[in-house]
C-alpha cells in the first residue's frame, strides 16, 4: 500500500504526524494562541512532547534566527506552578532551563540561550515570536 504523507499549510513544516508554523510576528501569549487558532485545523500554540520533537523544532527555527525567544503552548493558568499544554496534551516531557520560575512568569518560551532546546517561563504579556502546531 502507498501511504501518502499529509500536507501542511503553506509555510508550515511537517514532522511525525504534525504540522508546525513558526511566526516571526510579535504577539503576547494569549494573542499568539488566538492567532494559532485562527489558522483552523485545531491549531494551538505548540506542545513539545519529546526530545526528538524539541530537536527538530530547534533545528528548524535556528535556520531563521538564534536570538529571539519563542512562545510555546505551555502555561500556568492558575498561577500556581501547575503547568499545562493549551492543546490538552499530557505534561510529561519537561525541558526547563535552570532559570527561576518565580515572579509573574506564567507562560513558557523556547529559550534562545540553549538553541531553543530548553524552556524558560516569562511574563505572558511580552510580545514575542510564536510556534503553532496542528495534526493534519
Amino acid at each position: 500500500d502507498i501511504i501518502m504523507r499529509p500536507s501542511c499549510a503553506p509555510g508550515w513544516f511537517y514532522h511525525k504526524s504534525n504540522c508546525y508554523g513558526y511566526f516571526r510576528k510579535l504577539r503576547n501569549w494569549s494573542d499568539a494562541e488566538l492567532e494559532c487558532q485562527s489558522y483552523g485545523n485545531g491549531a494551538h500554540l505548540a506542545s513539545i512532547l519529546s526530545l526528538k520533537e524539541a530537536s527538530t523544532i530547534a533545528e528548524y527555527i535556528s535556520g531563521y534566527q538564534r536570538s529571539q525567544p519563542i512562545w510555546i503552548g505551555l502555561h500556568d493558568p492558575q498561577k500556581r506552578q501547575q503547568w499545562q499544554w493549551i492543546d490538552g496534551a499530557m505534561y510529561l516531557y519537561r525541558s526547563w532551563s535552570g532559570k527561576s520560575m518565580g515572579g509573574n512568569k506564567h507562560c513558557a518560551e523556547m529559550s534562545s540561550n540553549n538553541n531553543f532546546l530548553t524552556w524558560s517561563s516569562n511574563e505572558c504579556n511580552k510580545r514575542q515570536h510564536f510556534l503553532c502546531k496542528y495534526r493534519p
Epitope: K25, L26, S30, L34, N104, E123, C124, N125, K126, R127
Partner: antibody
Framework: QVQLQESGPGLVKPSGTLSLTCAVS?????????WSWVRQPPGKGLEWIGE???????NYNPSLKSRVTMSADKSKNQFSLKLSSVTAADTAVYYC???????????????WGRGTLVTVSS | QSVLTQPPSASGTPGQRVTISCSGS????????VNWYQQLPGTAPKLLIF???QRPSGVPDRFSGSKSGTSASLAISGLQSEDEAVYYC????????????FGAGTKVTVL
C-alpha cells in the same frame, strides 16, 4: 490615575545625542505594559519611535533602530530614550506613553505624557 | 509617506455624521487591531477607540470604529464643535521586525 512626565534638554546640537526621561507616577513600570516613545515634528503627524518592557526588552521603529536606545529604571519608576546623531529632522515634540494589552486582542496607548519639544540646532 | 492612508481633511456641520477612512495592508490592519487617537490643538493625543471598535470609559458613544479586511473607519455622529481635532488611526505592523504605525492624520473641521 497613571501620569507620565517627559523631561530633558529642549535644545540639542546637530550630530549630538538627544536624551529624554519619562517619569511614571500613579502606577509601576513593572506592570504588564510596554512603555513607548512617539514623536511629532512641528505641524506634522505622529511617528512611533519604539517601546520597552520593564525587563529591558525593546522593539524599535526600523527606520530609527540604528540610532535609538531605550532603557528602564525600575528603582526610579522611569524609562529613557536616547537618539544619537541627530539632525534638524529630529526636531519634534516627544511624547512618552503607556501601552496596554486589550482583552480582545491587540495593544493601545492609553496614557500619554504632555510632550516636550526638542529642537536640534547649533 | 505614512504606512496607513487617511484623507487629510473632513468636515461637517453640527449634528452631522462624519466618517474617516484608514487604509492599510495585510501586514498591519489586515492582521492586527486598529486604534484611533484624537489630538486637540496644542495637546497630546488621546485614545478614542481601541481594538477596532472599543471605547475607553469617558469617550462619548457618538464615536464608533469598525474594521473590514485591510481598512478601518471612524464615525462621528452628531458632530459637535469640540470634535474639531486631528484624528489618527494606528495599528501594529508585522513587516520587518514589527513596529507601530500611524496614519498621517485627518483634520476634522466643524463648519
Amino acid at each position: 490615575q497613571v501620569q507620565l512626565q517627559e523631561s530633558g534638554p529642549g535644545l540639542v546640537k546637530p550630530s549630538g545625542t538627544l536624551s529624554l526621561t519619562c517619569a511614571v507616577s500613579g502606577g509601576s513600570i513593572s506592570s504588564s505594559n510596554y512603555w513607548s516613545w512617539v514623536r511629532q515634528p512641528p505641524g506634522k503627524g505622529l511617528e512611533w519611535i519604539g517601546e520597552i518592557y520593564h525587563d529591558g526588552s525593546t522593539n524599535y521603529n526600523p527606520s530609527l533602530k540604528s540610532r535609538v536606545t531605550m532603557s528602564a529604571d525600575k528603582s526610579k519608576n522611569q524609562f529613557s530614550l536616547k537618539l544619537s546623531s541627530v539632525t534638524a529632522a529630529d526636531t519634534a515634540v516627544y511624547y512618552c506613553a503607556r501601552d496596554s494589552p486589550s482583552y480582545s486582542s491587540g495593544w493601545y496607548s492609553d496614557y500619554w505624557g504632555r510632550g516636550t519639544l526638542v529642537t536640534v540646532s547649533s | 509617506q505614512s504606512v496607513l492612508t487617511q484623507p487629510p481633511s473632513a468636515s461637517g456641520t453640527p449634528g452631522q455624521r462624519v466618517t474617516i477612512s484608514c487604509s492599510g495592508s495585510s501586514s498591519n490592519i489586515g492582521s492586527n487591531t486598529v486604534n484611533w487617537y484624537q489630538q486637540l490643538p496644542g495637546t497630546a493625543p488621546k485614545l478614542l477607540i481601541f481594538s477596532n471598535n472599543q471605547r475607553p470609559s469617558g469617550v462619548p458613544d457618538r464615536f464608533s470604529g469598525s474594521k473590514s479586511g485591510t481598512s478601518a473607519s471612524l464615525a462621528i455622529s452628531g458632530l459637535q464643535s469640540e470634535d474639531e481635532a486631528v484624528y489618527y488611526c494606528a495599528a501594529w505592523d508585522d513587516s520587518l521586525t514589527g513596529f507601530y504605525v500611524f496614519g498621517a492624520g485627518t483634520k476634522v473641521t466643524v463648519l
